[in-house]
């Protein structure tokens, strides 16, 4: 007996959108030559930060998302950086001032491009996650089919 392919809707984990937005902001600000390498270093630096400070930006992000539904959850964990906005800048920032001088477009055009780029980057990551989920679901359904046949 075969089990029909599940059309269960998987929700993007809370705080994940927040992480992607952080990465997107850094990519737009730092403009690396190698975006995948930059993303890897970015997430690595967040993990290091989490280990050192016990502050998890993803958890914080999920609480920000929950704020609408439950104000108390938001009060539980304040981010340690809150007092110093300068510290909010990523650990992998550091491009010098000179860079901004050489950017091609007017600031208005840049803003539009950055918005479009942000959407593209986030969509690409979400697409990747969706594909991974689909792979898992397919594997699970195949395993279930095999189990049924072996009965």
């Amino acid at each position: 007996m075969s089990i029909p392919f599940s059309n269960t809707h998987y929700r993007i984990p809370q705080g994940f959108g927040n992480l992607l937005e952080g990465l997107t902001r850094e990519i737009l600000r730092e403009q690396p030559d190698n975006i995948p390498a930059f993303a890897a270093a970015y997430f690595e630096s967040l993990l290091e930060k989490r280990e050192k400070t016990n502050f998890d930006p993803a958890e914080w992000g999920s609480k920000v998302e929950d704020r609408f539904y439950n104000n108390h959850a938001f009060e539980e964990q304040e981010p340690p950086e809150k007092s110093d906005p300068k510290q909010e800048e990523s650990q992998i920032s550091g491009k010098e001032e000179e860079t901004s001088v050489t950017i091609l477009d007017s600031s208005e055009e840049d803003k539009e491009k950055e918005e479009v780029a942000a959407v593209k980057i986030q969509a690409a990551f979400r697409g990747h996650i969706a594909r991974e989920e689909a792979k898992k679901m397919k594997t699970n359904s195949l395993q279930n089919e095999e189990k049924e046949e072996n009965k």
Epitope: N34, A37, K95, T99, A117
Partner: antibody, heavy 123, light 112 residues
Framework: QVQLQQSGAEVKKPGSSVKVSCKAS????????ISWVRQAPGQGLEWMGR????????NYAQKFQGRVTITADKSTSTAYMELSSLRSEDTAVYYC????????????????WGQGTTVTVSS | EIVLTQSPLSLPVRPGEPASISCRAS???????????LDWYLQKPGQSPQLLVY???NRASGVPDRFSGSGSGTDFTLKISRVEAEDVGVYYC?????????FGQGTKLEIK
């Protein structure tokens, strides 16, 4: 394995413009910046600028600002470098370059280069 | 704009001997991510440049282990443990810590 294929040699008159293309084949195009580097006869390497296709943002060296335009067409995985108001000093070999997917550096590390395009500016 | 100064500009070496090229930057190439954004390239006669070393000391794929990069901040060195005939060409360092990216003047290695 990613490869960069550049357009053929050009002979131009002073004051005119030249547009050199650089087509990437194999691998991902949008997530890796393409830089343009030129080399005048008997001289060293000179970075002109770059474009990050997914962002649509280009950066230029001050020396070329206002004369160079770098663009990218994601649908054809091709980057372009257009240099205007040409003068004899612009006679050079023009290279496009980018990092490969193997490289772990966020900046630089150009391990893929085009074969070069010779641009001769002569009246 | 960062300035890179290479030395020597000319380097005659006998096959099998070691060789060393220095690259000095006018300001630090160390970013807050802990990496030195300095690359070494070799341009053989009539060819496109090829990457030898990136991030100051990471050998690029397919580069023989006789090539090694070292240094941090403003002072960097490319060493060839035993020069071979195929190593002739011009060696360039390049900083990638900020745009505009800048190349050194180049060091011409020739066989004695």
């Amino acid at each position: 394995q990613v490869q960069l294929q550049q357009s053929g040699a050009e002979v131009k008159k002073p004051g005119s413009s030249v547009k050199v293309s650089c087509k990437a084949s194999g691998g991902t195009f949008s997530s890796y910046a393409i830089s343009w580097v030129r080399q005048a006869p008997g001289q060293g390497l000179e970075w002109m600028g770059r474009i990050i296709p997914i962002l649509g943002i280009a950066n230029y060296a001050q020396k070329f600002q206002g004369r160079v335009t770098i663009t990218a067409d994601k649908s054809t995985s091709t980057a372009y470098m257009e240099l205007s108001s040409l003068r004899s000093e612009d006679t050079a070999v023009y290279y496009c370059a980018r990092p490969s997917e193997e490289v772990v550096a966020a900046y630089g590390a150009f391990d893929i280069w085009g074969q070069g395009t010779t641009v001769t500016v002569s009246s | 704009e960062i300035v890179l100064t290479q030395s020597p500009l000319s380097l005659p070496v006998r096959p099998g001997e070691p060789a060393s090229i220095s690259c000095r930057a006018s300001q630090s190439l160390l970013r807050s991510d802990g990496f030195n954004y300095l690359d070494w390239y070799l341009q053989k006669p009539g060819q496109s440049p090829q990457l030898l070393v990136y991030l100051g000391s990471n050998r690029a794929s397919g580069v023989p282990d006789r090539f090694s990069g070292s240094g941090s901040g403003t002072d960097f060195t490319l060493k060839i443990s035993r020069v071979e005939a195929e190593d002739v060409g011009v060696y360039y360092c390049m900083q990638a810590v900020q745009t505009p990216y800048i190349f050194g003047q180049g060091t011409k290695l020739e066989i004695k």
